[in-house]
Interface confidence: medium
């Protein structure tokens, strides 16, 4: 089951997957001035059996005479209409990734591929967040997000990460010492819920993890 939307955006942070669940698709995108070869695949697909997972199909780009070739020329299949974009990541991965059953490694780059990779994640996929250079991570909990299915709908859990403008960068898992984080609801977010009767009140308040505001009115 494909995830319907993108992983959450965290100000001054980027995300990446350490491994990709079987069923994940990666668009075959080419950089400007290049396009997919005519008979080439639209996407790579992470497939596998109980013992081994790998990417099916290969992406191939060829020189293009036309200029507007940043995006695929062929329309994407309907189930691929939601796009998950991540920056190009280094193929270097934590050593334990290959042993994760049912997952594929980051596919190696192909010649003339686009600078951004567009993934189509599946339920159960986990992505990890880090603050961009120049920002420091404040962790309230795990700096990760998981695509979950709830009553037939998919959504991403909210990573408990805040990036502040101090000159110290956090690292991705496998590159940092593990941080203890308070156990809490896995998909909690800073949220507001205010209830009023008769009329609606717009309330500005500093929301904490426990703060809720649902505004209720009647007509």
């Amino acid at each position: 089951e494909l995830c319907d939307d993108d992983p959450p955006e965290i100000p001054h942070a980027t995300f990446k997957a350490m491994a990709y669940k079987e069923g994940t698709m990666l668009n075959c995108e080419c950089k400007r001035g290049f396009r997919r070869i005519k008979s080439g695949s639209l996407y790579m697909l992470c497939t596998g059996n109980s013992s081994h997972s790998s990417w099916d199909n290969q992406c191939q780009c060829t020189s293009s005479a036309t200029r507007n070739t940043t995006k695929q020329v062929t329309p994407q299949p309907e189930e691929q209409k939601e796009r998950k974009t991540t920056e190009m990541q280094s193929p270097m991965q934590p050593v334990d990734q290959a042993s994760l059953p049912g997952h594929c490694r980051e596919p190696p780059p192909w010649e003339n591929e686009a600078t951004e990779r567009i993934y189509h994640f599946v339920v159960g996929q986990m992505v990890y967040y880090q603050c961009v250079q120049g920002y420091r991570a404040l962790h309230r909990g795990p700096a990760e997000s998981v695509c979950k299915m709830t009553h037939g709908k998919t959504r991403w859990t909210q990573p408990q990460l805040i990036c502040t403008g101090e000159m110290e960068t956090s690292q991705f898992p496998g590159e940092e010492k593990p941080q203890a984080s308070p156990e809490g609801r896995p998909e909690s977010e800073t949220s507001c819920l205010v209830t009023t009767t008769d009329f609606q009140i717009q309330t500005e308040m500093a929301a904490t993890m426990e703060t809720s505001i649902f505004t209720t009115e009647y007509q």
Partner: antibody, heavy 104, light 106 residues
Framework: PGESLKISCKSS????????IGWVRQMPGKGLEWMGI????????RYSPSFQGQVTISADKSINTAYLQWSSLKASDSAMYYC??????????WGQGTLVTVSS | TQSPGTLSLSPGERATLSCRAS???????LAWYQQKPGQAPRLLIY???RRATGIPDRFSGSGSGTDFTLTISRLEPEDFAVYYC???????????FGQGTRLEIK
């Protein structure tokens, strides 16, 4: 009694469209009763059998608001009504409630 | 079914609240809430034993099958409230709350 009523629940601070929102009734001095849930993104709605046909749950995703509506109130509808965010198998954030009193 | 209906204890004591389901419930689908007078319920425990954000570690949940327990290891004055267990059923989709246990100061 007999009047219509629509109460609303405005959410902020999280991705409203990707969480189910539930409604829970609490009659005076009594316990909690689940009424139903709605998925604001596409207005998919599920009702408790006890409340099916008695109330209508709706949502307007453009203004992050869910609604609970009665077409004809009864005295037995007098209760506190809570909206709550559905965390999956439990409700992890609650509004402070709207008290509905039906009297002649 | 929650028992007892009312539990009278003193601050510092240990409280044990019981929740019994009519049929077996997956541990993933059992939650506990606290409600104080004039306030909305608050999630304490989900997945039988996982504490929600900001819940002190004196609250713990356990159990399996049809019998589940909420334990408050050492009662604080602010813990006196009504506690509800809640189970989830996926087909048909249904959230069922227990009738509540009132925890009062002895």
């Amino acid at each position: 009694p007999g009047e219509s009523l629509k109460i609303s629940c405005k959410s902020s601070g999280y991705s409203f469209n990707t969480y189910w929102i539930g409604w829970v009734r609490q009659m005076p001095g009594k316990g909690l009763e689940w009424m139903g849930i709605i998925y604001p993104s596409d207005s998919d709605t599920r009702y408790s059998p006890s409340f099916q046909g008695q109330v209508t749950i709706s949502a307007d995703k453009s203004i992050n608001t869910a609604y609970l509506q009665w077409s004809s109130l009864k005295a037995s509808d007098s209760a506190m009504y809570y909206c709550a965010r559905d965390g999956g198998y439990y409700f992890d954030d609650w509004g402070q409630g709207t008290l509905v009193t039906v009297s002649s | 079914t929650q028992s007892p209906g009312t539990l009278s204890l003193s601050p510092g004591e240990r409280a044990t609240l019981s929740c019994r389901a009519s049929q077996s419930v997956s541990s993933t689908y059992l939650a506990w809430y606290q409600q104080k007078p004039g306030q909305a319920p608050r999630l304490l425990i989900y997945g039988t034993s996982r504490r929600a954000t900001g819940i002190p570690d004196r609250f713990s949940g356990s159990g399996s099958g049809t019998d589940f327990t909420l334990t408050i290891s050492r009662l604080e004055p602010e813990d006196f409230a009504v506690y509800y267990c809640q189970q989830y059923n996926s087909s048909p989709l249904m959230y069922t709350f227990g009738q509540g246990t009132r925890l009062e100061i002895k």
